[in-house]
Interface confidence: low
Amino acid sequence: VPGEAEQPAPELVEVEVGSTALLKCGLSQSQGNLSHVDWFSVHKEKRTLIFRVRQGQGQSEPGEYEQRLSLQDRGATLALTQVTPQDERIFLCQGKRPRSQEYRIQLRVYKAPEEPNIQVNPLGIPVNSKEPEEVATCVGRNGYPIPQVIWYKNGRPLKEEKNRVHIQSSQTVESSGLYTLQSILKAQLVKEDKDAQFYCELNYRLPSGNHMKESREVTVPVFYPTEKVWLEVEPVGMLKEGDRVEIRCLADGNPPPHFSISKQNPSTREAEEETTNDNGVLVLEPARKEHSGRYECQGLDLDTMISLLSEPQELLVNYVSDVRVSPAAPERQEGSSLTLTCEAESSQDLEFQWLREETGQVLERGPVLQLHDLKREAGGGYRCVASVPSIPGLNRTQLVNVAIFGPPWMAFKERKVWVKENMVLNLSCEASGHPRPTISWNVNGTASEQDQDPQRVLSTLNVLVTPELLETGVECTASNDLGKNTSILFLELVNLTTLTPDSNTTTGLSTSTASPHTRANSTSTERKLPEPESRG
């Protein structure tokens, strides 16, 4: 009405769907008597009387609010229960005396939407599409008012970008008055989006403030052409014979092309296709030096029939050839000299070492080992090791046996063996020499002889302990073309005092073999008190 003062802004009352709204009539005593008030709802500028207060007593008017209104706070407040979205409107109270005044209340209604449901485009998106394609659809059900949708890619909000990103939102009103929101994210994706995580977020307000609910994260299949194929070799680094080597073809396209791996024939220089496993991997196990060469991968896009070739990759399977030692079977007289030479080929620089076989002692670093003034102890095994220092584990070895001419040499000269009468005694006797000696025993028994190495022999005798044997003892004799030598085993009966040896002796029932190299003594299955070894 012209000339009438502008109405003050209505008081704002905020409430969630389903709860009770308390509409407090803000008329002062001067503006009207609260014991005589009419309440109206205003919808589309039409007032509807919904409640009367007379002498402090309330009475609902027939209609949509009839069952949900009641008076509180000594008549000053109207309670509206089970609030619905349709209740979002202005309510006003009007006092009747002394003059008609009104107080307006704006009721705002809120309802948090359900958790957003996101569905990714299962068909995927090609990167070369001419316009934005559907990436995913987000649905937020039963919210009020309409929630705001924000789309995220990798945790960052996506904003409208002309011809690149488009967010298409629509909403439907349910019979409850709540909104269901559907938002479609359309985008032109690039290859880098293949791992991108997309999700939608519903922003909504409640009386308590702003809130948000997030959907799960999804990735969309992104299809992009292969631009590059390449070979990958495992393990990375220097390869050696015996390794398990895998050569695989990789591409930067999705889906990947059909792969084939070829190796250049060194003779014809033609590429020859290799047989790969079901996964398209060429497995070389064990790798050999013949596997060295130039490999390349071909990727064939079965849709476009476009073929791409990788950069060729040189594969080097490092090797060490068989090691050759000269002379191969050296024989020398005592006092003479010997030069042993080691040779091998490799794809890398070699390092040579000479080791004494029996002790593992390094004698020489280099391919040539010189031995002077040879003693009979110098006889035995010498090992040449050819190794590639830059590739751990890549080495080959060759053992050569040096023979020193000489008569038999006994592991021990004489030995005491503790026995019990009528037991079967297991005796052993070892000798070395060149030519390799044979061993004989001075008593009857079951003897067996085994060659330990080209210059060494071990003989074992099983014999019954008799009084005569205790009397005579046992002798073993080793013979070759250059002479003979004998070891004596004295047999002594075990008694209680011998079972308590002093600090200078040891006892044992184990069987062991005495040899010039191990410095062990003659053995018996009975306890023995060994003596210091003597060499014949």
Epitope: I150, R156, K159, E160, E161, K162, E201, N203
Partner: antibody, heavy 119, light 106 residues
Framework: QLQLQESGPRLVQPSGTLSLTCVVS?????????WSWVRQPPGEGLEWIGE???????TYKPSLKSRVSMTVDTSKNQFSLNLTSVTAADTAVYYC????????????WGQGTLVTVSS | YELTQPPSVSVSPGQTASITCSGD??????ASWYQQKPGQSPVLVIY???KRPSGIPERFSGSNSGNTATLTISGTQAMDEADYYC??????????FGTGTKLTVL
């Protein structure tokens, strides 16, 4: 080299409207960047006001939302800020800035212009 | 949403300066750092927690986890004396700047 240059009245009356323009040179305003306004009252810290996209989409700081509007003019390669109902509390150096693509930070800034609200 | 910084930090030349920025679950957001010298515009020195724009010396580094982001300047130089602001973003708070820290190189 991308450059941003703010321009507009340096003195605004209380309850009036502050209007600033940022001219972008060295790059197109239609690149996938958001263009922001940030202010700094004398001797105080930085405060983000809002941002605008070349499509016209905007985001404003909630506490300023009722007073702010931003627009883009792609033909002139520039964007603008309007702040209504200003008070002395709006006195500040106003910067325009570019948000880096794919990151929530500002990689290019204008040199800033001091706007004083006073009668 | 608020980001709190110490008002001032002092450091001797050649030493390491650390400026912190605290905010509720700040580690869940990207933090950026700006250097501002008197009378000049801010300059981005760290973005996305720890990345350095081209042209920014390697002595500037950043980290962000939990409720705290940290800007570290190793081998601080006199030219590093300036105000430093952290900044974070998320969907509900949008852009928020820290209160600012004055770095003094003694």
């Amino acid at each position: 080299q991308l450059q941003l240059q703010e321009s507009g009245p340096r003195l605004v009356q209380p309850s009036g409207t502050l209007s600033l323009t940022c001219v972008v040179s060295g790059a197109s305003i239609t690149t996938p960047n958001w263009w922001s306004w940030v202010r700094q009252p004398p001797g105080e810290g930085l405060e983000w006001i809002g941002e605008v996209y070349h499509s016209g989409s905007t985001t404003y700081k909630p506490s300023l939302k009722s007073r702010v509007s931003m627009t883009v003019d792609t033909s002139k390669n520039q964007f603008s800020l309007n702040l209504t109902s200003v008070t002395a509390a709006d006195t500040a150096v106003y910067y325009c800035a570019r948000e880096a693509v794919g990151a929530a930070d500002f990689d290019y800034w204008g040199q800033g212009t001091l706007v004083t609200v006073s009668s | 949403y608020e980001l709190t910084q110490p008002p001032s930090v002092s450091v001797s030349p050649g030493q390491t300066a650390s400026i912190t920025c605290s905010g509720d679950k700040l580690g869940d957001k990207y933090a950026s750092w700006y250097q501002q010298k008197p009378g000049q515009s801010p300059v981005l020195v760290i973005y996305q927690d720890s990345k350095r724009p081209s042209g920014i010396p390697e002595r500037f580094s950043g980290s962000n986890s939990g409720n705290t982001a940290t800007l570290t300047i190793s081998g601080t130089q006199a030219m590093d004396e300036a105000d430093y602001y952290c900044q974070a973003w998320d969907s509900s708070t949008l852009y928020v700047f820290g209160t600012g820290t004055k770095l003094t190189v003694l």
